[in-house]
């Protein structure tokens, strides 16, 4: 079941998945100047068996000024460096990403692709979130979200994060400044039964991840 | 899940014209690939034209000229503008975007 929304949006925070649940899908979009080839697939699906998971399709770009090819001009360095998400992609691949049944890897870069990356999560998906450059995470709990099922209906958990400028607190490192409840209804009134897949070894994987998750620098 | 709506299909005669609209819910829109595809009788479903989030288009040759694709994410809907219409355009009209179909629109052109 594909979750009805985005997941939330924290302010000056970014969320990557490390790994994306088997029938995620991934728009294939190209950058200004390409345009996906005609027989092109319009999305990546993530599938597979209980062994193996993999992404269906694949994308390609062609340029818009030449008709009938697609050949393909490799991004120049500064091209690459202008790329950016929501998902705060990278390069880099934890191990563990691959030991993790039922789900894919982040998707290789295909040539000429867009500068965003759209992804279309399933419940059960969980996403992990990072204060941008410049400010600092003052959280009391997980910086997670996770999409679940409820009465019918798909919606993100809360993230316990907050993001603050460095110069914006008097605080001493490691000292919380007190938090407003976050927005949204508190898992407490959620009395129904809600479904979720995974949690439990996600959550592991995200605690081993911690320290190296988020190595890289996003601009 | 998402909810995919088509209508504006009919009877046209050749060289005529006709507006498909397909209406979108269930999902933020402008995340959305669409892409119009239709399925004449006894043969398989094709690819007539997709449009990306920022309003991209792509269409198969065989429309090229003659359909536009467009988009408008205020109102959650695509719409494919036929024009110069042939019999061979005669098909069942489908809206899809993910892994979902809408029901479809039946396209006749006939004198």
């Known amino acids: 079941e594909l979750c009805d929304d985005d997941p939330p949006e924290i302010p000056h925070a970014t969320f990557k998945a490390m790994a994306y649940k088997e029938g995620t899908m991934l728009n294939c979009e190209c950058k200004r100047g390409f345009r996906r080839i005609k027989s092109g697939s319009l999305y990546m699906l993530c599938t597979g068996n209980s062994s193996h998971s993999s992404w269906d399709n694949q994308c390609q770009c062609t340029s818009s000024a030449t008709r009938n090819t697609t050949k393909q001009v490799t991004p120049q360095p500064e091209e690459q460096k202008e790329r950016k998400t929501t998902e705060m992609q990278s390069p880099m691949q934890p191990v563990d990403q691959a030991s993790l049944p039922g789900h894919c890897r982040e998707p290789p870069p295909w040539e000429n692709e867009a500068t965003e990356r759209i992804y279309h999560f399933v419940v059960g998906q969980m996403v992990y979130y990072q204060c941008v450059q410049g400010y600092r995470a003052l959280h009391r709990g997980p910086a997670e979200s996770v999409c679940k099922m409820t009465h019918g209906k798909t919606r993100w958990t809360q993230p316990q994060l907050i993001c603050t400028g460095e110069m914006e607190t008097s605080q001493f490192p490691g000292e919380e400044k007190p938090q407003a409840s976050p927005e949204g209804r508190p898992e407490s009134e959620t009395s129904c039964l809600v479904t979720t897949t995974d949690f439990q070894i996600q959550t592991e994987m995200a605690a081993t991840m911690e320290t190296s998750i988020f190595t890289t620098e996003y601009q | 899940e998402v909810q995919l709506v088509e209508s504006g299909g009919g009877l046209v005669q050749p060289g005529g014209s006709l507006r498909l609209s397909c209406a979108a819910s269930?999902?933020?829109?402008?995340?959305?690939?669409m892409g119009w595809y239709r399925q004449a009788p006894g043969k398989q479903r094709e690819l007539v034209a997709t449009?990306?989030?920022?309003?991209?288009?792509t269409y198969a040759d065989s429309v090229k000229g003659r359909f536009t694709i467009s988009r408008d994410n205020a109102k959650n809907t695509v719409y494919l503008q036929m024009n110069s219409l042939r019999p061979e355009d005669t098909a069942v009209y489908y809206c899809?975007?993910?892994?979902?179909w809408g029901q479809g629109t039946q396209v006749t052109v006939s004198s």
């Open positions: 899809k975007t993910l892994r979902y």
């Open positions: 449009i990306e989030r920022g309003g991209t288009p």
């Open positions: 269930g999902r933020r829109f402008s995340t959305l690939i």
